[in-house]
């Protein structure tokens, strides 16, 4: 299988956005690749985003994703919007080099993505 | 049920062009890659091009590669081959097909029918 | 190009019989190994995929085995409807290239 890196934790912003690297050693000579985000949560894993892409091209997630990502060589640097504290959990980044074949497929051990709220802000006296 | 029509099959004379279609239905059509495959007259089957769902990849056969295109217009879930001089080796039956599994060909057309000759 | 040899081309066999046809790359092919069966003027169908994955609605008497470079499509029970040519084909690397067919016939 091929090695997929992430980092171990990431901390949200106070916005609700988390951005983490995904990087992948390439066995051979991809020119498409996909890359899909997981989270696992209480043992369930479910797809958050995925994209494909031209080696040197941007990525392409769907209008509606909470994701966008940028590429550059076997590196992905994926960023996730509109998080919220329940959605903290393990985001796991997998990797298919899809084309020209063989196909290699990676899958990173997860970066533990921290969301936390915001406190309201008091209303203040003037 | 997943069905693959081809059409624009023909009679043509060597150095002619003729372009194929493929109307696909009964799956998500942007989701798939797609082939060409052809087959001579009593022969065995010849891979031709390939095309990814997004058509980002595509590839041909090395007696192909120049004189051939392929193309998809995922809008319209139709799949084409442009073939342009054209030889007496290209007459065949080509299939379309479906790659649903990586490197595999799941769904198959009917075929249509290539002859060249003078 | 990786070539692909079937053997026998053609065969012939008795309704029940356990009927086995083989297939051998040039190289290494890993487990990107797939068998399709055309019957006579008939559009190819996918039977096996990955060595040994029976495609849906396959008939469980059809089973696919090996590794590397050789590969065998074993029909365990031979019925009148599974006379057809039976092609191999590689999908490790481009070209995809196919056998050259197995034509198997009744007794």
């Known amino acids: 299988a091929m090695h997929v890196a992430q980092p171990a934790v990431v901390l949200a912003s106070s916005r609700g956005i988390a951005s983490f690297v995904c990087e992948y050693a390439s066995p051979g000579k991809a020119t498409e690749v996909r890359v899909t985000v997981l989270r696992q949560a209480d043992s369930q894993v479910t797809e958050v985003c995925a994209a494909t892409y031209m080696m040197g091209n941007e990525l392409t997630f769907l209008d509606d994703s909470i994701c966008t990502g940028t590429s550059s060589g076997n590196q992905v640097n994926l960023t996730i919007q509109g998080l919220r504290a329940m959605d903290t959990g393990l985001y796991i980044c997998k990797v298919e080099l899809m084309y020209p074949p063989p196909y290699y497929l990676g899958i990173g051990n997860g970066t533990q993505i921290y969301v936390i709220d915001p406190e309201p802000c008091p209303d203040s006296d003037f | 049920e997943v069905q693959l029509v081809e059409s624009g099959g023909g009679l043509v004379k060597p150095g002619g062009s003729l372009r194929l279609s493929c109307a696909a239905s009964g799956f998500t059509f942007s989701d798939y890659g797609m082939a060409w495959v052809r087959q001579a007259p009593g022969k065995g089957l010849e891979w031709v091009a390939f095309i990814s769902n997004l058509a980002y990849s595509v590839y041909y056969a090395d007696t192909e590669t120049g004189r051939f295109t392929i193309s998809r217009d995922n809008a319209k879930n139709s799949l084409y081959l442009q073939m342009n001089s054209l030889r007496a080796e290209d007459t065949a039956v080509y299939y379309c097909?479906?790659?649903?599994?990586?490197?595999?060909?799941?769904?198959w057309g009917q075929g249509t029918t290539v002859t060249v000759s003078s | 190009d990786i070539q692909m040899t079937q053997s026998p081309s053609s065969l012939s066999a008795s309704v029940g019989d356990r009927v086995t046809i083989t297939c051998r790359a040039s190289q290494d092919i890993s487990n990107y190994l797939n068998w399709y069966q055309q019957k006579p003027g008939k559009v190819p169908k996918l039977l096996i995929y990955?060595?040994?994955r029976l495609h849906s609605g396959v008939p469980s008497r059809f089973s696919g085995s090996g590794s590397g470079t050789d590969f065998t499509l074993t029909i365990s029970s031979l019925q009148p409807e599974d006379v057809a040519t039976y092609f191999c084909?590689?999908?490790?690397?481009?070209?995809?290239?196919f056998g050259g067919g197995t034509k198997v016939e009744i007794k």
């Open positions: 097909a479906r790659s649903g599994l990586p490197y595999a060909m799941d769904y």
């Open positions: 990955y060595i040994s």
């Open positions: 084909q590689q999908g490790r690397m481009l070209p995809w290239t």
